[in-house]
Interface confidence: low
């Protein structure tokens, strides 16, 4: 029986370890600066790194600019978006800016897109200062189903800070759905 | 066999409980207001509480102003930094401020420091208003190895809000590394 | 013994699954726009949705405008608060605003209220711009005991953005208390 107990414990430990890892998808995606759209309109950001520097992904998929959920669950989602402008880049089209981020969820089964989280600020970036910077952070806890897609929309994409520590978004699974 | 089963369940429950707790280091560190550097330059903040008020730590170490990882894993890191100024404190050196936070990771094995997250804003704190306030929040999911150190750098440290609900940073382990 | 082992594994899986779910309370509450207080003073927000749209709750209770903890543990708490004003809504009482959020914990046993997290900014919302917007995000890791209550206070409640993606707060349990 002792040997059996050891086997029980052993097999369960393996199972627990395996299922625990399988049960915890995550992603941390950082902006791909080589392909940031220009302009000031609201756009969906489609170019993100998933496998270099701080960027990583496990048990989720990154495709066509969207983070795809492979496993039902409750996830904590977050995004950090930095905007910056230096006078050497030339003048801003307008000094009154609306710097915004929208974290959206798209369901393929029911073709629809919904904003889960938004954040940002209107800013007056006057010519008085040679450098301007502003960051937005949002985060929240959401039920996600397999196949649903998370994407990021921003205003004024041409002002995005291209550093991996500045502009990123991510998700990690916290628990199963009952 | 029933007794054996009970023993198996019991021993496993203890083991599961124990390993679960061991697998989940965390820290929430709040600013130590008695030792905030002066000036407006970018500095590393080294004085944090880890055991009073909201501050707490478990299975991580706080030493020399840095939060040290004791256990490999994927962690959610966060920081909330508040800046404030009241006219009764005297005039600001400049009304144009860059209020920033940088969350950095240092590896002792390979002596190098890298910024994981940054946030902040340029601000115009004019003399028109008697009180100014601004908060930054950043958060993200990162792979941390035992021995790596997390630290916080800010600009304009003399403007930091010294309250424990205002200026803090923390981490909690979400999952093991595969 | 094989049958016994299967029974052990089976019962443990059920137990593990059950206890895992029971061990992970969460809530994501979104603003109830039909009942936002007016004015510019600091108020406690008492009207939140817990069961429509993105709002959800499990193993926690929402009552009298407060999120009540039912299970001891360490929780990650977060809040996202958006303020906005359009000139079509009429003039602001003052162009100099203090837009703030306070996440507070109340213990019924010891009737006392403490601020866990705060964030925000002073803003100058001038008549030059027809639209103004600003969002605050805060988050942190806290030990919460059964019966403790989490509530949200804001300044300038009349400026709150009533969208569910804009103004919300939440919590999820990360681990037990040792």
């Amino acid at each position: 029986i002792r040997a059996e107990k050891a086997m029980v414990d052993g097999s369960w430990l393996d199972l627990a370890k395996r299922s625990k890892l399988e049960a915890q998808p995550f992603a941390h995606l950082t902006i791909n600066a080589t392909d940031i759209p220009s302009g000031s309109h609201k756009v969906s950001l489609s170019s993100w790194y998933h496998d270099r520097g701080w960027a990583k992904i496990s048990n989720m998929t990154f495709s066509n600019g969207k983070l795809i959920v492979n496993q039902d669950g409750f996830y904590y989602l977050y995004a950090n978006i930095c905007f910056r402008h230096h006078e050497t880049s030339g003048d801003l089209a307008t000094e009154y800016l609306q710097l915004m981020v929208y974290v959206t969820k798209t369901s393929i089964k029911i073709p629809s897109s919904h904003t889960l989280m938004k954040g940002g600020s209107t800013k007056y970036w006057s010519g008085n200062s040679e450098f301007h910077f502003y960051s937005i952070n949002v985060g929240g806890f959401f039920k996600l189903r397999s196949g649903e897609e998370i994407s990021i929309e921003v205003s004024n994409p041409s002002l995005l800070d291209p550093d991996q520590d500045a502009t990123y978004f991510g998700a990690f699974k916290v628990r199963d759905i009952d | 066999i029933r007794a054996e089963k009970a023993m198996v369940d019991g021993s496993w429950l203890d083991l599961a409980k124990r390993s679960k707790l061991e697998a989940q280091p965390f820290a929430h560190l709040t600013i130590n207001a008695t030792d905030i550097p002066s000036g407006s330059h970018k500095v590393s903040l080294s004085s944090w509480y880890h055991d009073r008020g909201w501050a707490k730590i478990s299975n991580m170490t706080f030493s020399n102003g840095k939060l040290i990882v004791n256990q490999d894993g994927f962690y959610y890191l966060y920081a909330n930094i508040c800046f404030r100024h009241h006219e009764t404190s005297g005039d600001l050196a400049t009304e144009y401020l860059q209020l920033m936070v940088y969350v950095t990771k240092t590896s002792i094995k390979i002596p190098s420091s890298h910024t994981l997250m940054k946030g902040g804003s340029t601000k115009y704190w004019s003399g028109n208003s008697e009180f100014h306030f601004y908060s930054i929040n950043v958060g993200g999911f990162f792979k941390l190895r035992s021995g790596e150190e997390i630290s916080i750098e800010v600009s304009n440290p003399s403007l930091l809000d010294p309250d424990q609900d205002a200026t803090y940073f923390g981490a909690f382990k979400v999952r093991d590394i595969d | 013994i094989r049958a016994e082992k299967a029974m052990v594994d089976g019962s443990w899986l059920d137990l593990a699954k059950r206890s895992k779910l029971e061990a992970q309370p969460f809530a994501h509450l979104t603003i109830n726009a039909t009942d936002i207080p007016s004015g510019s003073h600091k108020v406690s927000l008492s009207s939140w949705y817990h069961d429509r749209g993105w709002a959800k709750i499990s193993n926690m209770t929402f009552s009298n405008g407060k999120l009540i903890v039912n299970q001891d543990g360490f929780y990650y708490l977060y809040a996202n608060i958006c303020f906005r004003h359009h000139e079509t809504s009429g003039d602001l009482a003052t162009e100099y605003l203090q837009l703030m959020v306070y996440v507070t914990k109340t213990s019924i046993k010891i009737p006392s209220s403490h601020t866990l997290m705060k964030g925000g900014s002073t803003k100058y919302w001038s008549g030059n711009s027809e639209f103004h917007f600003y969002s605050i995000n805060v988050g942190g890791f806290f030990k919460l005991r059964s019966g403790e209550e989490i509530s949200i206070e804001v300044s300038n409640p009349s400026l709150l953005d009533p969208d569910q993606d804009a103004t919300y707060f939440g919590a999820f349990k990360v681990r037990d208390i040792d």
Epitope: S40, H41, D91, A93, S126, S129 | - | S126, N128, S129
Partner: antibody, heavy 115, light 107 residues
């Protein structure tokens, strides 16, 4: 009501100088970028200069070094100092407030450059 | 500099007609485009900003659309007071530049 009232247009000889003025009312003058746009007889609109609230000044290539834009917030006034005027500078000159596009315009003032 | 090209240069229409004027930028300007109306001996008047936002006080029969390089101004039902010259203008980068204008005449 937002208003921009212009003055200073005149007949001037080639090589001469002129100063145009534009007085704003009905808005906080110091908070807006302000611009000068001109229109030669029978032609289209041409932006020539702008000043941002921080004092940054901008010019089209054809007037750089000859024209100077300035403002006096205390007087709610915008100015365009035009030196070394040429025949091709003859036009109606408009001042305009710039927020999202040029949302308000002055009534225009005629500058004639002729010998 | 960014070149702005309007078409047509002129057009004739009648009261009640639906009229469309197009404007093309030599490079992408996002939505930083404005439309103005100018009547003889008068200052231009702002109609549309940010490609599609109606300036305060402008009748809703005026609308703008487009993004990037191609833009349109539409007057859904022409009124007698709409006969004028229309200009597009980019303010994506300095120097701001105008189209050559489209003269709208009574048929």
């Amino acid at each position: 009501e937002v208003q921009l009232v212009q003055s200073g247009g005149d007949l001037v000889h080639p090589g001469g100088s002129l100063r145009l003025s534009c007085v704003g009312s009905g808005f906080t003058f110091s908070h807006y970028p302000l611009h000068w746009v001109r229109q030669a007889p029978g032609k289209g609109l041409e932006w020539i200069s702008g000043i941002h609230t921080g004092g940054g000044t901008y010019y089209t290539d054809s007037v750089k070094g000859r024209f100077t834009i300035s403002s006096d917030n205390a007087k709610n006034s915008l100015y365009l100092q035009m030196n070394t005027l040429r025949a091709e500078d003859m036009a109606v000159y408009y001042c305009a407030r710039g927020r999202n596009s040029f949302d308000y315009w002055g009534q225009g003032t005629l500058v004639i450059v002729s010998s | 500099d960014i070149q702005m090209t309007q078409s047509p240069s002129s057009l004739s229409a009648s009261v009640g007609d639906r009229v469309t004027i197009t404007c093309r930028a030599s490079q992408g300007i996002s939505s930083w485009l404005a439309w103005y109306q100018q009547k003889p001996e008068k200052a231009p008047k702002s109609l549309i900003y940010a490609a599609s936002s109606l300036q305060s006080g402008v009748p809703s029969r005026f609308s703008g659309s487009g993004s990037g390089t191609d833009f349109t101004l539409t007057i859904s039902s022409l009124q007698s007071e709409d006969f004028a010259t229309y200009y597009c203008q980019q303010y994506n980068s300095y120097p701001p530049t105008f189209g050559q204008g489209t003269r709208l005449e009574i048929k």
